[in-house]
Interface confidence: low
């Protein structure tokens, strides 16, 4: 498949009722659009037994299965069932393939691990596939920032990568917040760096034929404490269908220990605002940043009453920050079908 192509099953016509099981390999990052039945009476898509909502990153909508950008967790078995019956119109398994060609730093198609290639000859010692991405040797970043080191490589057999810090094996176990090793991207990620993270980081890439290494230098610049910083665009305006689950995300960066609160704006006596001009709110969740998943507000099985404005508010000893988003709740797409199959539920 070319990078610009979508995965498609066309045309969007009613397929034969004796639909054979298919297996499709999809590259990471690739858009997917699969058709099932005629557009106006398309079937309903299910993943691993759960019906897909018509809104969201992965959606089943008017007979189409649409995935904006294929991720590893999107792999699995997908069924399309005819409306009002249990007839299988499509039965397919999506398998994760290689990454697409992309200028995105996270993706590295030339350096993927290809199992079919693992023992093919001739053998080749590891080599850097994108040395131009490794030219920045010294990384001087403010405390609290995220640092990513990458050593994209290839070879035959496919090499392995490990990391050293100041010459010692580095797994991040002594580091608050740990580290993320993304082997398929040949990367080491450290979030919220602190002065003790300073040092020389070495990527060591090796296979049976040979090994190569490269050093990065990290300097962490200390800074004065600041009020919490909320990632722009979060929480994001979201549209969901009645009965589906919603996650609102609020990413908080703070030197000083922050508290986070999720608020829902409510109406009292027909008004959203008090006499002082400030909004009425209901507190949904409150905790400090160390609490698990406090940065995510989960809304299960949403109803029309859940629609409205939600605010993520973060405060620390320096100050406050908060941002809001709107949740729009759409009516269920096809209530007659839902009644016929009560076990079906929306997941997003």
């Amino acid at each position: 498949l070319e990078a610009s192509e979508e995965v498609e099953l066309e045309p969007c016509l009613a397929p034969s009722l004796e639909q054979q099981e298919q297996e499709l390999t999809v590259a990471l990052g690739q858009p997917v659009r699969l058709c099932c039945g005629r557009a106006e009476r398309g079937g309903h898509w299910y993943k691993e037994g759960s019906r897909l909502a018509p809104a969201g990153r992965v959606r089943g909508w008017r007979g189409r299965l649409e995935i904006a950008s294929f991720l590893p967790e999107d792999a699995g078995r997908y069924l399309c069932l005819a409306r009002g019956s249990m007839i299988v119109l499509q039965n397919l398994t999506l398998i994760t393939g290689d990454s697409l060609t992309s200028s995105n730093d996270d993706e590295d198609p030339k350096s993927h691990r290809d199992p079919s290639n693992r023992h093919s000859y001739p053998q080749q010692a590891p080599y850097w596939t994108h040395p131009q991405r490794m030219e920045k040797k010294l990384h001087a970043v403010p405390a609290g920032n995220t640092v990513k080191f990458r050593c994209p490589a290839a070879g035959n057999p496919t090499p392995t990568i490990r990391w050293l810090k100041d010459g010692q094996a580095f797994h991040g176990e002594n580091r608050i917040g740990g580290i993320r090793l993304r082997h398929q991207h040949w990367s080491l990620v450290m979030e919220s760096v602190v002065p003790s993270d300073r040092g020389t980081y070495t990527c060591l890439v090796e296979n049976a034929v040979g090994s190569i290494r490269y050093n990065y230098l990290l300097d962490v610049l200390e800074r004065s404490p600041h009020r919490p910083i909320l990632q722009a665009g979060l929480p994001a305006n979201t549209t969901a269908v009645v009965g589906s689950d919603v996650e609102l995300l609020c990413k908080v960066y703070s030197d000083a220990q922050p508290h986070i609160q999720w608020l829902k704006h409510i109406v009292i006596n027909g008004s959203s605002f008090g006499a002082d001009g400030f909004p009425y709110v209901q507190v949904l969740k409150t905790a400090d940043i160390n609490s698990s998943e406090v940065e995510v507000l989960y809304l299960r099985n949403v109803s029309a009453e859940d629609a409205g404005e939600y605010t993520c508010l973060a405060g620390n000893s320096i100050g406050l920050s908060y941002q809001s988003a709107w949740l729009t709740v759409l009516p269920e797409e096809d209530p007659t079908w839902t009644a016929a199959a009560p076990e079906a539920r929306y997941t997003d």
Epitope: R227, F278, G319
Partner: nanobody
Amino acid sequence: EVQLQASGGGFVQPGGSLRLSCAASGRTSWLTTMGWFRQAPGKEREFVSAISSFSSKQGYYADSVKGRFTISRDNSKNTVYLQMNSLRAEDTATYYCAYASYPRHQGNGRWKDFVEYWGQGTQVTVSS
């Protein structure tokens, strides 16, 4: 207009305790933060502690008072309290009660940026 009435200041020896209280009256909002700032002679007014109306347990504290001071509030009385233990000479200052409510959709700033109303100061002196 919101009026703030602070009380509880006084003279205490190092290691001693005091409890400040601040009552808000007038057109108060229930989506608010109330708290305390202090100002020592010749120094800038600095944040001490604050608490939200919808979070009766969690307070925000300046590093210099963490573990020694505890803020609490009684929403029914629109009153905020500051329990000050293990007082030190460097805690000597005029303590000001502060009141803030949130703008509508988003915002950020240091605590002082949010203050809409200040109470009159109450003097705290820690000396042997």
